[in-house]
């Protein structure tokens, strides 16, 4: 043999019960002690420190705390130093050292010692991770190191959690004993925070001990709080709230179009949008995630705003007879009423649409002019003007004529055309043509699509001359012999060589 002692490094006992500390020791056989004596010390291995003597084989003298409460169960001669402590109280909790006394110089306090823990609650052992939906085993363990009093176990608050299975008395690694009862069940998320209890009672005594454990059930997030769709006026403040139930708390993330806007580990997360713009209109997603799963929900944000200034696209110049298509479009929320006016006359209108198509089949000169596209909703009105130019061959209007007065003849040639025509006056009897470029004789004035050219003739009175007015543009030429109004003497101006 060699010097050594074996005892549990720790051992537990319920207050008021007893505890048997199993202990054996060894020493070299050649020491051959005639008698083996021993001492149990409390809290210190050194007699110099005058530690309380728990038990001493040579004498009956023990510390008052252990008077009548300590007894050696083991036989020191058989190298068994097992100690029994009865009616244990909290002050007996601590370290217990055994000192072998073999005579001569061979007294030895073994460094191995036992720490006694006086408990008053059963130990409920819950696995480090309890996941909702996965079967779990919860055990209640109590020390069973008192040969005189044996504990009986029962569960408290386990209704609906399955029937307990009693494992009975089990030996632990270091020779201590425990009573164990098991509970198997599949926890739900609702079981999180549930208090599960275990009671140890000792038959034929009033001793009863209870312990409780709160279930920490892990479960994936479920989003439980979320705005329904939100409408907000441009420039206003918007708060989007997302709340989730999970354990542990989830990582909450607000996203839009794949971009993370805000995230935090929390049970709820507020997304604050200051002075919203139409650009922030859209679908916002809240993602809740923890190690056990995830959930996501979306909310639509509708930003309400007045229409933008309409834009007009299409042909702004057309040839008479062509079909003209003009598109007026805007952006607003809600969609606007779109109307196209010409000279206060409604030509086309749509309700709650963002674009309006105006179709003018076979345009005529009357279609030429200024148009307005007006967009309006409850938040405002915007308008855009545009001009449609209809091009056509000259038309000589009926008000074209010649009139004589004293010594002059004035001929008016009134032409409607687009683009502006060139005008020429022809006097066939004289084989003369006067162009509008000849400012001495011709004065032209345009008003809209109407060009008025005036030919002034001066000279002797004669028979009224024939005057033919010809108007010409890229679409064609029109001629008209100008009628005379009233028979007056004709004044004549010599034109030409």
């Amino acid at each position: 043999g060699h010097w050594g002692a074996w005892m549990p490094s720790s051992i537990s006992a319920f207050e008021g019960t007893c505890v048997s500390i199993p202990c054996r020791f060894d020493f070299p056989d050649e020491l051959r002690p005639a008698v083996v004596h021993g001492v149990w010390y409390f809290n210190s291995p050194y007699p110099k420190n005058y530690p309380p003597v728990v038990f001493k084989s040579r004498t009956q003298v023990v510390h008052e705390s252990f008077q009548g409460r300590s007894r050696l169960l083991g036989d020191l001669g058989l190298r068994n130093c097992t100690l029994l402590l009865s009616n244990v109280s909290p002050e007996l909790g601590g370290k217990y050292y055994f000192r072998g006394d073999l005579g001569g110089y061979n007294q030895y306090t073994f460094s191995e010692h036992s720490v006694l823990d006086i408990v008053n609650t059963p130990n409920i052992v819950v696995p480090p991770e309890v996941v909702a939906g996965t079967e779990v085993e919860v055990s209640c363990m109590v020390p069973d190191n008192c040969p005189e009093l044996r504990p009986e176990l029962s569960w408290l608050g386990h209704e609906g959690l399955g029937e307990p299975a009693v494992l009975g008395r089990l030996r632990e690694d270091e020779g201590t004993w425990v009573q164990v009862s098991l509970l198997h069940f599949v926890p739900t998320r609702e079981a999180n925070g549930h208090r599960l209890g275990c009671q140890a009672s000792f038959p034929n005594t009033t001793l009863q001990f209870e312990g409780y454990a709160s279930m920490d059930v892990k479960y994936p997030p479920v989003i439980v709080e979320m705005n329904s769709s939100v409408e907000a006026i441009e420039g206003s403040h918007v708060s989007l709230l997302c709340g989730a139930d999970s354990n542990p708390p989830p990582l909450l993330t607000w996203m839009r179009d794949g971009t993370v806007l805000r995230e935090a580990v929390a049970e709820s997360l507020l997304l604050e949008l200051e002075e919203v713009t139409p650009a922030e209109d859209g679908v916002y997603a809240c993602l809740a995630e923890n190690a056990y799963g995830q959930d996501n929900r979306t909310v639509g944000l509708s930003v309400m705003y007045a229409p933008w200034k309409p834009t007009v696209n299409g042909t702004m110049v057309a040839v008479e007879g062509e079909t003209v298509s003009i598109l007026c479009s805007t952006q607003s929320n809600p969609d606007p009423i779109l109307t196209i006016f010409k000279e206060k006359q409604i030509l086309s209108t749509v309700i709650y649409e963002s674009e309006l198509q105006l179709e003018l089949p076979a345009v005529s000169p009357e279609d030429d002019g200024e148009y307005w596209c007006v967009a309006e909703n409850q938040y405002g009105q915007r308008a855009t003007a545009f001009n449609l130019s209809v091009e056509f061959a000259p038309v000589l209007l009926l008000e074209s004529h010649c009139a004589a007065a004293r010594d002059t003849v004035q001929c008016l040639c009134v032409v409607k055309s687009n683009p502006e025509p060139s005008v020429a006056f022809e006097l066939p009897s004289r084989n003369v043509t006067v162009n509008e470029s000849e400012r001495e004789f011709v004065y032209s004035e345009r008003s809209g699509l109407v060009l008025t050219s005036i030919l002034t003739l001066r000279g002797q009175a004669q028979a009224p001359p024939r005057v033919i007015c010809t108007a010409r543009n890229l679409y064609g030429a029109k001629s008209l012999e100008l009628p005379f109004q009233g028979a007056h003497r004709l004044m004549w101006a010599k034109i030409g060589p």
């Epitope: 060699h2 010097w3 070299p28 050649e30 020491l31 051959r32 002690p33 005639a34 291995p45 050194y46 007699p47 110099k48 005058y50 000192r99 073999l102 005579g103 001569g104 110089y105 061979n106 007294q107 030895y108 306090t109 460094s111």
Partner: antibody
Framework: QVQLVQSGSELKKPGASNKVSCKAS????????MNWVRQAPGQGLEWMGW????????TYADDFTGRFVFSLDTSVSTAYLQISSLKAEDTATYFC???????????????????WGQGTLVTVSS | DIVMTQSPDSLAVSLGERATINCKSS????????????LAWYQQKPGQPPKLLIY???TRESGVPDRFSGSGSGTDFTLTISSLQAEDVAVYYC????????FGQGTKLEIK
């Protein structure tokens, strides 16, 4: 140098008590245990036991339990042997002798008594 | 307890001659853990305390003349004085300190 100086000879009546002192010097008192050895006139040596000067724990040989008490006063580096209820057969020279110790008190190193006091003769006679 | 028996009880040797004292233990004093013999020899002159000569069965204490030597193992041990001097006249004790300490009865050494 190491010295163990014992108290002087004593003549005692049967039933009386006697206390022999052993004052140590020249070394650290608590690093060495103190043994007590008895030698009756014309007889051999008998080991009575020892006291661990570090822990204060006495150990008595089987023949010397009861009337014999070992004690210490470490402040003056002195060990004491008290004999009560003296008997005629207690007449002897009592020696103190030191031996090295370790703090656990196990004699694994095989410490031996290396220095002895001069002895104290205790005579018990009526 | 381990009983130590010395022989002879007394011994007379001429000056300068070798003196041999034997000691037998009732049980081995060889400690298996360190393979050492827990045996010492003491010299005691009249009116004086014992003086340590040898420990570990063969290790000479400092200051002890080298004419003193110890030998043996287990249960049989010997103290040898190689050349006896007049000042060596004394009683010699063997002593085991493995278990509860015991001494031999002593051997008285005289000059022949």
């Amino acid at each position: 140098q190491v010295q163990l100086v014992q108290s002087g000879s004593e003549l005692k009546k049967p039933g009386a008590s006697n206390k022999v002192s052993c004052k140590a010097s020249g070394y650290t008192f608590t690093n060495y245990g103190m043994n007590w050895v008895r030698q009756a006139p014309g007889q051999g040596l008998e080991w009575m036991g020892w006291i661990n000067t570090y822990t204060g724990e006495p150990t008595y040989a089987d023949d010397f339990t009861g009337r014999f008490v070992f004690s210490l006063d470490t402040s003056v580096s002195t060990a004491y042997l008290q004999i009560s209820s003296l008997k005629a057969e207690d007449t002897a020279t009592y020696f103190c002798a030191r031996n090295p110790i370790n703090y656990y008190g196990i004699n694994y190193e095989g410490y031996v008594m290396d220095y002895w006091g001069q002895g104290t003769l205790v005579t018990v006679s009526s | 307890d381990i009983v130590m028996t010395q022989s002879p009880d007394s011994l007379a040797v001429s000056l300068g001659e070798r003196a041999t004292i034997n000691c037998k233990s009732s049980h081995s004093v060889l400690y298996s853990s360190n393979q050492k013999n827990y045996l010492a020899w003491y010299q005691q002159k009249p009116g004086q305390p014992p003086k340590l000569l040898i420990y570990w069965a063969s290790t000479r204490e400092s200051g002890v003349p080298d004419r003193f030597s110890g030998s043996g193992s287990g249960t049989d041990f010997t103290l040898t004085i190689s050349s006896l001097q007049a000042e060596d006249v004394a009683v010699y004790y063997c002593h085991q300190y493995l278990s509860s300490l015991t001494f031999g009865q002593g051997t008285k050494l005289e000059i022949k």
